[in-house]
């Protein structure tokens, strides 16, 4: 009886794992083995595919074959018993194009209200992704084990920290990789779960802001308790993208080590041009807080995003605010040639109730004010570009009294 060729050959490539699967053509014939040949582009001869010779099952692995993953190859298969079937040719393919990204490795660390996620490619030193190692981005799905309500986080790198979680709570997550340059989305990792710790005695510092004063950076933060010491550390932001390395060498800012105030001042030349991460930690001598949320600090933007300067024209029921370019030392205006949006906060001098206006224009009306009342105004600028999502610090507050009634015209 003539042997039939195997059919429906599927090539599955995940990272550097090359798997072939096929269907037997004739289930009734026993003791049949299968063999593959391959052919590279531009070659006439067929070569035996090592790892896929005389296979008794309907699956084989040819990962050991050192292929150029960007080069097209062709495969053929036949069945063998006493005689052999005709060859069945598989459509030619390029391994890189066919390859899927495998599940990444995930390492979790817990704090009381945060989880640190370290992500590594599933295959270390992968040949398939050798040229793309630094281009991987990741996305994750996270949920409270008790509720199952999922939150998706996109476009993260090999280290990511999720904040504002609940203490003593189990969170579960799964991660997948993507190579956006090649339109490839990977396979999810297994689900990993971790329980956040009991609430720490000392909370981390909050609301970290960087501003520029003369030739210095001023770093400010808020803290709940008095009589604390603080330290500040920085890290090059690009190091979060380093796929294999999970040793993050955070550096101390010398002028911000063991400071007793909720701010520190350090020279601009501490940082070369670049994007950095900053974090602050509090200590009372016995206990230490976890690190604050990491803020992104771009020296380029920081250097030129100064608080706006404004003038107020007071009427009885409104202020007209005219926003001008901020002044550098030496009173020269700073030219800011990128679109800004202005946030204006105003409040009655005798009250803490703040109201907010967001405006793109540089002349703004603050309506619905009471006559003969002192109002205070402060403003800050935000970049409108999402990638350079940056804010200046607030200007100093300016307080003015509204005019008597009937002067609004």
């Amino acid at each position: 009886k003539n042997l039939k060729s195997p059919q429906k050959v599927e090539v599955d490539i995940i990272d550097d794992n090359f798997i072939l699967r096929w269907n037997r053509s004739d289930e009734s014939v026993g003791n049949v083995t299968f063999s593959f040949d391959y052919q590279k582009t531009g070659m006439d001869n067929w070569i035996k595919l090592s790892g896929c010779q005389n296979i008794t099952s309907t699956k084989c692995n040819f990962s050991s074959l050192k292929l150029n993953v960007y080069e097209e190859i062709k495969l053929r298969i036949r069945a063998e018993k006493e005689n052999t079937s005709s060859w069945y040719e598989v459509d030619s393919f390029t391994p890189f194009r066919k390859a899927q990204i495998g599940p990444p490795e995930v390492h979790l660390e817990a704090e009381d209200k945060a989880i640190v996620i370290h992500i590594s490619p599933g295959t270390k030193d992968s040949v398939m992704w050798a040229l793309d190692g630094l281009s991987f981005t990741y996305s994750l799905v996270i949920w409270k084990n008790s509720s199952g309500v999922e939150e998706r986080i996109e476009n993260i790198y090999s280290r990511h920290k999720i904040y504002k979680l609940s203490p003593e709570t189990t969170y579960c997550l799964k991660v997948k990789a993507a190579l956006l340059t090649s339109w490839k989305i990977g396979v999810y990792s297994p689900v990993h779960c971790i329980k956040t710790t009991v609430e720490n005695e000392l909370p981390p510092p909050e609301n970290i802001e960087v501003s520029v004063q003369n030739q210095n950076y001023v770093l400010k933060w808020d803290y709940t308790y008095a009589n604390m010491t603080f330290q500040v550390q920085w890290l090059h932001a690009f190091l979060k993208r380093n796929p294999g390395n999970h040793l993050y060498k955070w550096k101390q800012i010398p002028d911000c080590e063991n400071v007793k105030t909720t701010q520190c001042v350090f020279p601009q030349n501490v940082f070369q041009k670049g994007i950095y991460l900053l974090r602050v930690q509090a200590s009372d001598g016995n206990n230490t807080s976890f690190w604050s949320e990491e803020i992104k600090f771009d020296t380029e933007i920081q250097a030129f995003l100064l608080p706006p300067v404004f003038n107020i024209r007071s009427l009885s029921d409104s202020f007209h605010i005219y926003i001008g370019a901020p002044k550098q030392s030496g009173n020269t205006p700073v030219i800011q040639d990128y679109p800004l949006i202005y946030e204006i906060i105003f409040w009655e001098n005798t009250s803490n109730a703040e109201r907010k206006i967001i405006e793109k224009k540089t002349d703004v009306t603050v309506p619905n004010l009471k006559p003969l009342t002192v109002y205070c105004v402060k403003a800050r600028a935000h970049t409108m570009d999402e990638k350079l999502n940056k804010s200046s610090v607030f200007s100093d507050a300016v307080c003015e009294k509204t005019k008597p009634g009937n002067t609004s015209k």
Epitope: H107, E109, N200
Partner: antibody, heavy 118, light 107 residues
Framework: EVQLQQSGAKLVKPGASVKLSCTAS????????MCWVKQRTEQGLEWIGR????????KYAPKFQGKATITADTSSNTASLQLSSLTSEDTAVYYC???????????WGQGTSVTVSS | DTVMTQSQKFMSTSVGDRVSVTCKAS??????VAWYQQKPGQSPKALIY???YRYSGVPDRFTGSGSGTDFTLTISNVQSEDLAEYFC?????????FGGGTKLEIK
């Protein structure tokens, strides 16, 4: 294969200084922290300090501030520990270790025995 | 500095048993705890990092657990070659600290 080879045993007089070395192979010390740990006979482990060989930044446990000085030479892939004003309390085995991923010490040297005696 | 306390200096167990070595931190260190094994006359060997992660080559009978201030190293199906001293260490802050060690004796 990652290995940390430490210098041989030292016998030194009280008040003197001693310098111990730790030569790494199988990895570049610039990519890691290099740590030093002290262990006295039949006692526990004490972390002395660490260096980032990439820029020379050091950090010491308060107890060893002024006593220990850690340096690194990236050209020879070597970290060193200098101990000054030695007393009998400094008699111990000193280990170098690599500060690896997630800050844990993943590889250790074989240890160097330092005996302070007149 | 964070103090790491291993309250049991000695523990006695038999081959095939399950034993748990405990370690308590004086303050919350998250999950930044490592465990080391030191056999007589040898240098320490890393077993566990980040409280629960086993180094490659470490037998899966070694398991780490815990977070915050309380940590445990469990050895299931104890073997004679597990006769050693076990140290915990916090790697949460720059000034790492070790526990005093727990010596495991095999009956």
């Amino acid at each position: 294969e990652v290995q940390l080879q430490q210098s041989g045993a030292k016998l030194v007089k009280p008040g003197a200084s001693v310098k111990l070395s730790c030569t790494a192979s199988g990895f570049n010390i610039k990519d890691y922290y290099m740590c030093w740990v002290k262990q006295r006979t039949e006692q526990g482990l004490e972390w002395i300090g660490r260096i980032d060989p990439e820029d020379g930044e050091t950090k010491y446990a308060p107890k060893f501030q002024g006593k220990a000085t850690i340096t690194a030479d990236t050209s020879s892939n070597t970290a060193s520990l200098q101990l000054s004003s030695l007393t009998s309390e400094d008699t111990a085995v000193y280990y170098c270790a690599r500060g690896g991923n997630y800050y844990a010490m993943d590889y250790w040297g074989q240890g160097t025995s330092v005996t302070v005696s007149s | 500095d964070t103090v790491m306390t291993q309250s049991q200096k000695f523990m006695s167990t038999s081959v095939g048993d399950r034993v748990s070595v405990t370690c308590k931190a004086s303050q919350n260190v998250g999950t930044n705890v490592a465990w080391y094994q030191q056999k007589p006359g040898q240098s320490p060997k890393a077993l566990i990092y980040s409280a629960t992660y086993r180094y490659s080559g470490v037998p899966d009978r070694f398991t780490g657990s815990g977070s915050g201030t309380d940590f445990t190293l469990t050895i299931s199906n104890v073997q004679s070659e597990d006769l050693a001293e076990y140290f915990c260490q916090q790697h949460n802050s720059y000034s790492y600290t070790f526990g005093g060690g727990t010596k495991l004796e095999i009956k």
